[in-house]
Interface confidence: low
């Protein structure tokens, strides 16, 4: 039975040509994370953060893209293409998988960093929750779909 | 069925150039990163470099850089490489490998097409 | 030369078992590079059998199983069959850096 939820910083704003850290926390459960994906808006995997192999960052963002801290991603040189939703994805074991959501807005620098409205949201419970069956293949250690497709 | 079909053999004089193409069909093209791998007559593999079509977004092993265009037309969802200033040693088969995963370039290959071999000679 | 070092062949009757190796022996493809296992018979195109160090794609056999330890990555093969006589190569991708294959490995079914 999954019991724990993802917290994320949910609904966030940032200036163009800043930074900003995205992150997730996964509490009230005692599963061992195995892996976190971070996935931009279209899917596009932008990183990954694995229990044995440490980070992987897609090549595509290895420029502006830094791992941590922790179990989360710092975004940098933002543009405004960089505005949408961006997800965590935590596979653990023996849980499944937990998905979190989190909405990013680029600012053009004239406009104040972080907008009233979207202060307001700080923190949400980020509550999509997808559990999938997994094929323990290698050990038991569990984690990953025995696919080779998107994750 | 996903697969990618890659164009047909290729002689070629030493410093001259030679452009392969890759057409993918069977998935959402621009989403998935196309690499380029090549592999010379009795040797191993050798990754040359790669294009997100989503993102425009190149890399190419450091040993080519200057010497390799890669490039994507997603309209007609096909990938290119063009290697330029052959040289005897360029001669291999070059393979289009698609990657596993939606985004990036370079990380592990699930789909590839069937080679084209690339003959560089006087 | 490259940063991956593999054993040039290795050999087994059928239904054995044999183990390829693949070590890191640069800094970039160390300990916390990701690796993947690719098989290649004679005159064909490569076939991915695992990815990120023990994951199978979906119509590779359970027969191949993959593993890593330290800056070495195995793959093992159980139940040797003939039509498993290929070569095999490994690869790493590490973070933020480009694929490096290994020079691959000659895989002999004896019999």
């Known amino acids: 039975m999954m019991t724990g939820t993802i917290e994320t910083t949910g609904n966030i704003s940032a200036k163009k040509g800043g930074s900003v850290i995205l992150q997730c926390h996964l509490s009230s459960t005692m599963a061992q994370v195995t892996q976190v994906n971070w996935e931009q808006h279209d899917h596009s995997l932008l990183a990954i953060r694995n229990a044995e192999l440490g980070w992987h960052i897609y090549p595509a963002f290895k420029d502006r893209v830094a791992p941590g801290p922790g179990l989360g991603l710092t975004l940098q040189s933002l543009t405004m293409n960089d505005t949408g939703e961006y997800f965590c994805t935590y596979h653990t074991y023996p849980d499944g998988t937990y998905r979190g959501r989190i909405f990013l807005e680029v600012l053009e620098s004239s406009v104040a960093e972080h907008s009233a409205r979207f202060q307001e949201n700080l923190y949400f419970q980020g509550l999509e929750h997808h559990h999938h069956h997994h094929h323990h293949h290698h050990g038991g250690s569990g984690g990953l779909p025995e696919t080779g497709g998107d994750r | 069925e996903v697969q990618l079909v890659q164009s047909g053999a290729e002689v070629k004089k030493p410093g001259s150039s030679v452009k392969v193409s890759c057409k993918a069909s069977?998935?959402?093209?621009?989403?998935?990163?196309i690499s380029w791998v090549r592999q010379a007559p009795g040797q191993g593999l050798e990754w040359m470099g790669g294009?997100?079509?989503?993102?425009?977004?190149?890399d190419v092993a450091e040993k080519f850089q200057g010497r390799v265009t890669i490039t994507a037309d997603k309209s007609t969802s096909t990938a290119y490489i063009e290697l330029s200033s052959l040289r005897s040693e360029d001669t291999a088969v070059y393979y289009c490998?698609?990657?596993?995963?939606?985004?990036?370039?370079?990380?592990?290959?699930?789909?590839w097409g069937r080679g084209t071999l690339v003959t560089v000679s006087s | 030369q490259s940063a991956l070092t593999q054993p040039r062949s290795v050999s087994g009757s059928p239904g054995q078992s044999v183990t390829i190796s693949c070590t890191g022996t640069?800094?970039?493809?160390?300990?916390?590079?990701?690796r993947s296992w690719y098989q290649q018979h004679p005159g064909k195109a490569p076939k991915l059998m695992i990815y990120?160090?023990?994951y199978r794609p979906s119509g590779v056999s359970n027969r191949f199983s993959g593993s890593k330890s330290g800056n070495t990555a195995s793959l093992t093969i159980s139940g040797l069959q003939a039509e498993d006589e290929a070569d095999y190569y490994c690869?790493?991708?590490?973070?933020?850096?480009?694929?490096?294959f290994g020079a691959g490995t000659k895989l002999t079914v004896l019999g």
């Open positions: 490998a698609r990657d596993l995963r939606r985004g990036g370039v370079g990380d592990a290959f699930d789909i």
């Open positions: 069977g998935y959402t093209f621009a989403s998935y990163g």
């Open positions: 640069s800094p970039d493809v160390g300990s916390h590079a990701y």
């Open positions: 690869s790493s991708y590490p973070p933020s850096s480009a694929t490096v």
């Open positions: 990120e160090v023990s």
């Open positions: 294009i997100t079509p989503f993102f425009n977004r190149v």
